[in-house]
């Protein structure tokens, strides 16, 4: 809608790991920045947001369809990870250095 | 995209060229089946949406606050190509038999 | 700065035709959705018709075959032709800015014209 | 079609007072949705646009939360000049729908 700020973006998100239950196994970090893809993808689709070639199809076809088809979503296209201290099966505390997928690098419509 | 009800899975989005203003340089088809990926990301995220831990993290975060947090969305996680007969940048037809990332092979939540 | 004009209100008998206009200045036209919202007296907002800067249009089922919706972006109007109209197409007709060029938030409004249909 | 269901449809409140209304939408609409003001016999003005961002030019007293179905426009400080209609409006796509409005009236 109105204004670059509402096309698809990467956004602040802080998570504390308390409001998700995963306090229970992750002794630390307490919270952690995991970012969200948020804001529309809106034609035309930009360079910044990598559209797929199906994206960019059914950008264009929503544009005929609205009510048929829906738009791309903005969702995240790469992932980076974050070093935890968790309780392992025994209970314990272990390092793991790149606990994978955990933030967002990139977004995307797709 | 998103839907109302329903959980993510691969629809059928059959598109005509012509709809999308590409039959000036696609000569065949004239359509196709690009699917479509429908349907929400409900907790809990089931195997065969394949989620990312992110997508995790986001939909559980979404549980506690919901008007702050976004679901995640259920999109194409893996394309396949389509063979088409296309004018090339002197206007010859050409085939192109592998035309890469126009049709959803898998949808996820991400 | 942005200025949406609207003309062409009045009133009209049930069955009969009419055209609204919609002069915009203070941005490129071209580039933004333009939409027709209506307000019945005494009621909410009606959204009625959009035509986005692709090109694209649609309408609102209660108009569907009967309203058309056009633009001429060499003269910055926006048009609404209303054919077959009915008593309840009785409203203040605005025009509105999308702030984008497809469906968004109607960051600019013009002031209405009164369409009345009664015999 | 997407509907659009405001609530309160009325509500009376006093200058300074904290002002709260709601939106929900019969699907989800991640946050393609919009706050407008109308005075009688004027245009709507729009307030926040995305469900969260403040339109220029408009007071900071309003603010805008909500994802998904449900929104949420307050009002931290009620002024005289806020006394009028409010509705909201999806722009998730086409057709753009309204909320029915809510009117603050002085109690």
């Known amino acids: 809608s109105t204004g670059a700020g509402s096309h698809c973006q990467k956004t602040s998100l802080r998570v504390n790991f308390e409001d998700i239950g995963w306090n229970s196994w992750i002794i630390a970090p307490k919270e952690y920045e995991a970012y969200e893809c948020k804001g529309g993808c809106f034609f035309p689709l930009a360079d910044d947001v990598t559209p797929t070639k199906h994206a960019i199809v059914q950008t264009l076809v929503h544009l005929k369809f609205p009510t048929k088809v829906g738009k791309a979503c903005c969702v995240p296209t790469k992932l980076s990870p974050i070093s935890i201290l968790y309780k392992d099966d025994m209970g314990v505390p272990t390092l793991k250095y790149h606990y994978e997928g955990m933030s967002v690098a990139e977004c995307g419509c797709r | 995209s998103t839907g109302a009800g329903s959980h993510c899975q691969k629809t059928s989005l059959r598109v005509n060229f012509e709809d999308i203003g590409w039959n000036s340089w696609i000569i065949a088809p004239k359509e196709y089946e690009a699917y479509e990926c429908k349907g929400g990301c409900f907790f809990p995220l089931a195997d065969d949406v394949t989620p990312t831990k992110h997508a995790i993290v986001q939909t559980l975060v979404h549980l506690k606050f919901p008007t702050k947090v976004g679901k995640a969305c259920c999109v194409p996680t893996k394309l396949s190509p389509i063979s088409i007969l296309y004018k090339d940048d002197m206007g010859v037809p050409t085939l192109k038999y592998h035309y890469e990332g126009m049709s959803v092979a898998e949808c996820g939540c991400r | 700065q942005v200025q949406l004009l609207e003309s062409g209100g009045g009133l009209v008998q049930p069955g009969g035709s009419l055209r609204l206009s919609c002069a915009a200045s203070?941005?490129?036209?071209?580039?933004?959705?333009m939409s027709w919202v209506r307000q019945a007296p005494g009621k909410g907002l009606e959204w009625v018709s959009i035509?986005?800067?692709?090109?694209?249009?649609h309408y609102a089922d209660s108009v569907k075959g009967r309203f058309t919706i056009s633009r001429d972006n060499s003269k910055n109007t926006l048009y609404l032709q209303m054919n077959s109209l009915r008593a309840e197409d009785t409203a203040v007709y605005y025009c509105?800015?999308?702030?984008?060029?497809?469906?968004?938030?109607?960051?600019?409004w013009g002031q209405g014209t009164l369409v009345t249909v009664s015999s | 079609d997407i509907q659009m269901t405001q609530s309160p449809s009325s509500l009376s409140a006093s200058v300074g007072d904290r002002v709260t209304i709601t939106c929900r939408a019969s699907?989800?609409?991640?946050?393609?949705l919009n706050w407008y003001q109308q005075k009688p016999g004027k245009a709507p003005k729009l307030l926040i646009y995305?469900?969260?961002n403040l339109q220029s030019g408009v007071p900071s007293r309003f603010s805008g939360s909500g994802s998904g179905t449900d929104f949420t426009l307050t009002i931290s400080s009620l002024q005289p000049e806020d006394f009028a209609t409010y509705y909201c409006?999806?722009?998730?796509?086409?057709?753009?729908?309204f909320g029915q409005g809510t009117k603050v009236e002085i109690k």
């Open positions: 035509t986005l800067g692709t090109g694209h249009t």
């Open positions: 509105a800015r999308g702030s984008y060029i497809i469906w968004s938030a109607l960051d600019y």
């Open positions: 409006q999806q722009s998730d796509t086409s057709p753009l729908t």
């Open positions: 995305d469900a969260s």
């Open positions: 203070g941005f490129t036209f071209s580039s933004y959705a």
């Open positions: 699907q989800d609409i991640r946050s393609y």
